[in-house]
């Protein structure tokens, strides 16, 4: 059997790190056997077999130029194995941050925080830390850990499944190379780490007959779990074009009725979502969608001059649909006592 | 104990190519380097080039690059060695000789190549 | 290419005597040089390796020295078998190359 222990990394590839001693393995010959070195495509003996070292070959602080292919043989010639020396650094922890899209997954991404040139893999995993009384604050970790499952393809991700959302866990991701091994572990809590997609199919409506107003609606992210105990909500942006400042406010529900739009000029209007007990952090924007209110039509009554004729406020009926998703007030505002009043002024 | 038995003297014309093998026993061929040399009349030695153990890896005199291949056959341990558009000039006994990756520790018996018009 | 210099191009000596025989390199090539003997109608044979190596079944009276450029094969008291041709041999870099020969004649 061979004398060289084989490292993590495809066969036939030693490594060791720049600045350093490195030692080569002859992997084929008994341990000891005094063997020569020469670098593959030079003749020239690196170490004969009376330096002492038996199998291995010793390169004091090695650099790039030592890498390459090497050539051991045995004392009567024979071939003993060739060896190639890539260079690198032991792995550093890893940088590890965590998010969550729900409450019930939770996905953790990670980054080398140095690039070691080596070949790397990352072992990834979790465990559930739980409160062991009532009043204690003591956490032990409980039964695990579990591996968390890795996105094929290489994707620097794992996820996990079936997450608790009161719960705590410890997240391990270790970065392997053949010079060493290090971990980062981080402690999520579902709560902190989430983070809804925004909010979908954000639409932006004129509303008949009211040249100041805007209905926007939008739904629920598909990736919100559907039930009712986790509701959503929401923030909800709107500008006039080339205007630089956003408007916001909060809606109730899944629909907003935007009553001091510009008149006769297209509104951006983008919205985000946050846990409604605002656990974790608000949504990123939801891609803007655009409108314009409508031209304003003229009232049956006409005010004296100097007057001014205020209209109540009345919109048509509209129906409604139900909202697909839990919300706060299923059927959301169509009016708002926030808003200012629009005042049609008719100068004769 | 280690042999190698070359094949029989040759007389090729200028232009012509010459292939000369090298029969290879009491050993594991595939476990030791196979060089060629040549020896013109009454003159020294030239390394024309080696071929690797396992992985039939060549290394060529530049002198030859563009007119010698060695090959090997592992199943019968056969090395084989041709020259090609020769000239009077390569008229040498070639040996093929069992070494390491740059010595020649045991040799063949020789092959004559004559080169005549 | 590394040239390789042999002198005397002829030595002639008694058998019992010392023969030292000389090989010089176009450029330092460490201790990469090899020696070997040719007798008439044969294949060579490796003598030394590496400038002072001995080879195993070869008779003690074979000695080398020297390193960079500078090399000496020494044969301490010579046998009638010894005259023949002898080749030093570089192996520092492509291509391998052997020096023209020195030949040990009888006196």
């Known amino acids: 059997s061979s004398p060289c222990p084989q490292a993590w990394g495809p066969p036939g590839v030693q490594y060791g790190q720049p600045g350093r001693s490195v030692k080569l393995c002859c992997p084929g010959v008994t341990a000891g056997d005094p063997v020569s070195w020469f670098r593959d495509g030079e003749p020239k003996l690196l170490q004969g077999p009376d330096s002492g070292l038996g199998h291995e070959l010793v390169l004091a602080q090695a650099d790039s130029t030592d890498e390459g292919t090497y050539i051991c043989q045995t004392l009567d010639g024979a071939l003993g194995g060739t060896v190639t020396l890539q260079l690198g650094y032991p792995p550093a922890r890893p940088v590890v941050s965590c998010q969550a899209a729900d409450y019930e997954n939770f996905s953790c991404t990670w980054s080398p925080s140095q690039i070691s040139g080596l070949p790397t893999r990352y072992l990834t995993s979790y465990r559930k830390k739980t409160v062991l009384g009532a009043d204690s604050q003591r956490r032990s970790p409980s039964t695990g850990p579990w591996p968390c499952p890795q996105d094929p393809l290489g994707a620097a991700r794992c996820v996990v499944h079936g997450a608790e959302f009161w719960s705590q866990y410890r997240i391990n991701v270790t970065e392997v190379n053949p010079l060493g091994a290090s971990t980062r572990l981080l402690d999520v809590s579902l709560q902190s780490i989430l983070r809804p997609d925004p909010p979908q199919g954000l639409r932006v409506e004129s509303v008949p007959g009211y040249p100041r107003r805007l209905r926007a609606s939008w739904t629920y992210p598909a990736s919100w779990p559907c039930q009712p105990h986790f509701l959503l909500k929401f923030r909800l942006q709107y500008r006039p074009a080339q205007h630089p400042a956003w408007s916001t406010v909060e809606p109730a529900g899944l629909e907003e009725v935007i009553t001091d739009a510009v008149a006769g000029l297209p509104h951006a209007v983008r919205v985000s979502a946050r846990d409604f007990l605002d656990a974790g952090t608000w949504s990123t924007w939801s891609p803007e969608a655009w409108g314009t209110p409508s031209t304003g039509t003229i009232p049956k009554e006409i005010p004296a001059w100097g007057q001014l004729h205020t209209q109540p406020e009345v919109e048509p009926q509209v129906d409604s649909p139900a909202p697909p998703r839990p919300s706060l007030q299923p059927h959301p505002r169509l009016l708002d006592h926030r808003d200012s009043v629009e005042q049609v002024a008719v100068l004769a | 104990q280690v042999q190698l038995v070359q094949s029989g003297a040759e007389v090729k014309k200028p232009g012509a190519s010459v292939k000369v093998s090298c029969k290879a026993s009491?050993?594991?061929?595939?476990?030791?380097?196979m060089h060629w040399l040549r020896q013109r009349p009454g003159q020294g030695l030239e390394w024309i080039g080696n071929?690797?153990?396992?992985?039939?890896?060549?290394h060529y005199n530049q002198k030859f690059k563009d007119r010698v291949t060695m090959t090997v056959d592992k199943s019968t341990s056969t090395a084989y060695m041709e020259l090609s558009s020769l000239r009077s000039e390569d008229t040498a006994v070639y040996y093929c000789a069992r070494g390491d990756y740059v010595l020649f520790t045991y040799w063949g018996q020789g092959t004559l190549v004559t080169v005549s018009s | 290419d590394i040239v390789l210099t042999q002198s005397p191009a002829t030595l002639s000596l008694s058998p019992g005597e010392r023969a030292t025989l000389s090989c010089r390199a176009s450029q330092s090539i460490s201790n990469n040089l090899h020696w070997y003997q040719q007798k008439p109608g044969q294949a060579p044979r490796l003598l030394i390796k590496?400038?002072?190596q001995s080879i195993s079944g070869i008779p003690a009276r074979f000695s080398g020295s020297g390193s960079g450029t500078d090399f000496t094969l020494t044969i301490s008291s010579l046998e009638p078998e010894d005259f023949a041709v002898y080749f030093c041999q570089q192996s520092y870099s492509w291509p391998l190359t052997f020096g023209q020969g020195t030949k040990l004649e009888i006196k």
């Open positions: 590496y400038a002072s």
């Open positions: 071929i690797g153990p396992s992985d039939s890896k060549t």
């Open positions: 009491g050993y594991t061929f595939t476990n030791y380097w």
